[in-house]
Interface confidence: medium
């Protein structure tokens, strides 16, 4: 149903080896990044914290899909992860490697 | 070409009458809101200020489009417009009605 296909956070596990980042990220081997999937149809739900622009764009799309594209379901809040990484050949610990995991999705 | 279809800001004029907002917004009659259109393919250009998560997602999509969706082209910076609007029957001037016009697009 449409509600089940609405913008929400879904699992996305990242294996650093798969994307070639194991060459400089030593640990962890991977992490749960999540992703944002689904549609942003008008009216946009409050929990998706739409901007005024997103509301207007979704409304225009509803009235004329040729005139404007739909608002898009994207991460609106990201969280850091901790990593061990190589810096000039030295293993370094980064407590907060920012912007790596989705904590909230919204319509933009 | 792919470059021409890359994530960028495109014109989108909003006529408040068309979306029914002329019932409370007195002026202006409309405004250039812009919208963000185009694809976010890996590698993501620097001017699109991708988050680490967006870079990773685009990379995963490149390697396995079933596993992750593309990063999305969305407004990353919005600007206010000035409006005259009705507030409980009172004509009120708002110098900065925030989040109405796209000034920058990016991949998220």
């Amino acid at each position: 149903n449409a509600k089940g296909n609405y913008c929400k956070r879904t699992p996305l596990y990242i294996d650093f080896k798969e994307i070639g980042w194991d060459s400089w990220i030593i640990a962890p081997p991977g992490y749960e990044a999540y992703e944002c999937r689904g549609v942003c149809n008008y009216p946009l739900a409050e929990h998706l914290t739409p901007t005024k622009h997103a509301i207007i764009q979704a409304l225009v799309h509803l009235k004329n899909s040729q005139k404007a594209s739909k608002a898009c379901c994207v991460p609106t809040k990201l969280e850091p992860i901790s990593i061990l990484y190589l810096d000039k050949g030295v293993v370094t610990y980064k407590f907060k490697y920012e912007g790596m995991a989705v904590s909230e999705c919204g319509c933009r | 070409n792919a470059k021409g279809n890359y994530c960028k800001r495109t014109p989108l004029y909003i006529d408040f009458k068309e979306i029914g907002w002329d019932s409370w917004i007195i002026a202006p009659p409309g405004y250039e809101a812009y919208e963000c259109r185009g694809v976010c393919n890996y590698p993501l250009a620097e001017h699109l200020t991708p988050t680490k998560h967006a870079i990773i997602q685009a990379l995963v999509h490149l390697k396995n489009s079933q596993k992750a969706s593309k990063a999305c082209c969305v407004p990353t910076k919005l600007e206010p417009i000035s409006i005259l609007y009705l507030d409980k029957g009172v004509v009120t001037y708002k110098f900065k009605y925030e989040g109405m016009a796209v000034s920058e697009c990016g991949c998220r």
């Epitope: - | 007195i26 002026a27 202006p28 009659p29 409309g30 405004y31 250039e32 809101a33 600007e79 206010p80 417009i81 000035s82 005259l84 029957g89 009172v90 004509v91 009120t92 001037y93 110098f95 109405m100 016009a101 000034s103």
Partner: antibody, heavy 115, light 111 residues
Framework: QVQLQESGPDLVQPSQTLDITCTVS????????VHWVRQPPGKGLEWMGT???????DYNSAFKSRLAISRDTSKNEVFLKMDSLQTDDTAKYFC?????????WGQGILVTVSS | QFVLIQSDSMSTSAGSTVKLSCKRS????????VYWYQQHEGRSPTTMIY?????PDGVPDRFSGSIDSSSNSASLTINNVQIEDEAVYFC??????????FGGGTKLTVL
Amino acid sequence: QVQLQESGPDLVQPSQTLDITCTVSGFSLTTYNVHWVRQPPGKGLEWMGTMWNGGGIDYNSAFKSRLAISRDTSKNEVFLKMDSLQTDDTAKYFCARLGYYVDYWGQGILVTVSS
Amino acid sequence: QFVLIQSDSMSTSAGSTVKLSCKRSTGNIGSSYVYWYQQHEGRSPTTMIYDGDKRPDGVPDRFSGSIDSSSNSASLTINNVQIEDEAVYFCQSFSSGIKFIFGGGTKLTVL
């Protein structure tokens, strides 16, 4: 610092077109709005129109369809174009910056409509 | 469409208090903010009052704005009038049609 400077002709023939440029400095036209206001000699102020920061334009309906306001944000210029001038359009024409309120004005340009 | 009515001229003496009036012809004066501008001879106007009762930086606190619903008027009061206050004062408000409406202006003479 913030400045607005009007430029254009001093004298215009009746039935001709008036073109005035307001060149601004010290602020962005995408952040602030610009009014056009005129004042006939010895008379009051008359709002002509507004170039809104978002690109929209509003006109005083008294000028009907003979007034056009536009801008070039890259050159920091706002333009006023008015057709079919008559002698009663003789006035000082001001541009003014509208932020929370009108906080800066140009010095104005006196335009005389006469043959 | 409403108009804002101001008396053409007023005279007052230095040191006194003067109240300039701006009457709305139709509709409620309180339905939109009133602004006051001062214009000295041969100069550009400057804003003295915005949002009905607020003063921009640099405007002396001798100037104040108010609304009188009973007379459907806005007022600009100048306390301890100075010679340099001699000027024309314009009120301005909003309408849904013309959008920005100015009163005809009151010429204040300081004796």
